[in-house]
Interface confidence: low
């Protein structure tokens, strides 16, 4: 029986050229976290493995930094970074838990004026 829940930073916005922290937190379960995958759609960004530590996919090495904690920091943001991000917690014995974050990267002038967005 999977009892855990994932809390995420939800829908977030950041400005072009800036950085953002993606955070997920798994609670309400005693399952052991063996690994956390960070994915954009089903493209792998990074992995934090309990035994092997962090691995950042080569294509994202220049713009992705591990942490804080099990989170992920995206740097030098571009408008193309807008989209869905998933934290996938691999646990034993529960299996997998997935959290979703939507990031919108705004042009600097738009972000400065406090633009907000909605997910339909």
């Amino acid at each position: 029986m999977m009892t855990g829940t994932i809390e995420t930073t939800g829908n977030i916005s950041a400005e072009k050229g800036g950085s953002i922290i993606l955070q997920c937190h798994l609670s309400s379960t005693t399952a052991q976290v063996t690994q956390v995958n960070w994915e954009q759609q089903d493209q792998l960004l990074a992995i934090c493995n309990a035994d092997l530590g962090w691995h950042i996919s080569p294509s994202f090495k220049d713009r992705v930094a591990p942490g804080p904690g099990l989170g992920l920091t995206l740097q030098s943001l571009t408008v193309n970074d807008t989209g869905e991000y998933f934290c996938i917690y691999h646990t034993y014995p529960d299996g997998t838990y997935t959290g979703r974050i939507f990031l919108e990267v705004l042009e600097s002038s738009v972000a400065e004026h406090g633009a907000r967005f909605q997910i339909p």
């Epitope: 029986m1 999977m2 052991q32 063996t34 690994q35 995958n37 089903d42 792998l44 992995i47 493995n49 309990a50 035994d51 092997l52 691995h55 996919s57 998933f86 996938i88 691999h90 646990t91 034993y92 014995p93 529960d94 299996g95 997998t96 838990y97 997935t98």
Partner: antibody
Framework: EVQLVESGGGLVQPGGSLRLSCAAS????????MSWVRQAPGKCMEWIGN????????NYAPSLKNRFTISRDNAKNSLYLQMNSLRAEDTATYYC???????????????????WGQGTMVTVSS | DIQMTQSPSSLSASVGDRVTITCRTS??????LRWFQQKPGKAPKLLIH???NLANGVPSRFSGSGSGTDFTLTISSLQPEDFATYYC?????????FGCGTKLEIK
């Protein structure tokens, strides 16, 4: 582009053996769990088993583990399926599939195949 | 083993129809479910991962829902290229198990 190309299929007599190969390209083979899945004509898809990225750990469907062995050669970017004591019911298309990056053996998502080859047909008949 | 009950086994529908395929598991698997599409002579293609997440490059008319033991794949408006066989796969427990497929045919 991820490519998985299976080979080694064909006609084999009951009781015989066959070794299937899967040539992988377009990704770092040694970073990924790999699996074999089969599909018999008119039957359900069946997961055969998987192998950890470094070859040190395997899982099998209980009904097949005594006859089938999965191995890999990371230097050759190749995955293998050794099938012994073949039976008519092993007639199927065999697919090589790739899972996610370096998932630990406790994580079931490792073999939840993301990429598939085109398959190779194995016919067991006298 | 976790048993997968996929229904219906076959379905006739027309272009533009809304179609729903269900997969029921014999025990709670959380969201550890994937949906695949397979066309004759082709390799299966991943549509949905984590029960609800659209795989990269998959049209938004496909959606997945459910958790625990009951899961649904919905195609909101069928297109000609959607006529194929659809499979669910659980990856919460070894051995991994598939549903037996739903063949979607043109009415």
């Amino acid at each position: 582009e991820v490519q998985l190309v299976e080979s080694g299929g064909g006609l084999v007599q009951p009781g015989g053996s066959l070794r299937l190969s899967c040539a992988a390209s377009g990704f770092t083979f040694s970073d990924h769990w790999m699996s074999w899945v089969r599909q018999a004509p008119g039957k359900c898809m069946e997961w055969i088993g998987n192998i950890q990225y470094d070859g040190s750990y395997t899982n099998y469907a209980p009904s097949l583990k005594n006859r089938f062995t999965i191995s890999r050669d990371n230097a050759k970017n190749s995955l293998y399926l050794q099938m012994n004591s073949l039976r008519a019911e092993d007639t199927a298309t065999y697919y090589c599939t790739r899972g996610h990056f370096r998932i630990t053996m406790a994580s079931m998502g490792a073999s939840a195949s993301v990429y598939w080859g085109q398959g190779t047909m194995v016919t067991v008949s006298s | 083993d976790i048993q997968m009950t996929q229904s219906p086994s076959s379905l006739s529908a027309s272009v533009g129809d809304r179609v729903t395929i269900t997969c029921r598991t014999s025990q709670d698997i959380g969201n550890s479910l994937r949906w695949f599409q397979q066309k004759p002579g082709k390799a299966p293609k991943l549509l949905i991962h984590g029960a609800t997440n659209l795989a990269n490059g998959v049209p938004s008319r496909f959606s997945g829902s459910g958790s625990g033991t009951d899961f649904t794949l919905t195609i909101s408006s069928l297109q000609p290229e959607d006529f194929a066989t659809y499979y669910c796969l659980q990856h919460n427990e070894y051995p991994l198990t598939f549903g037996c497929g739903t063949k979607l045919e043109i009415k």
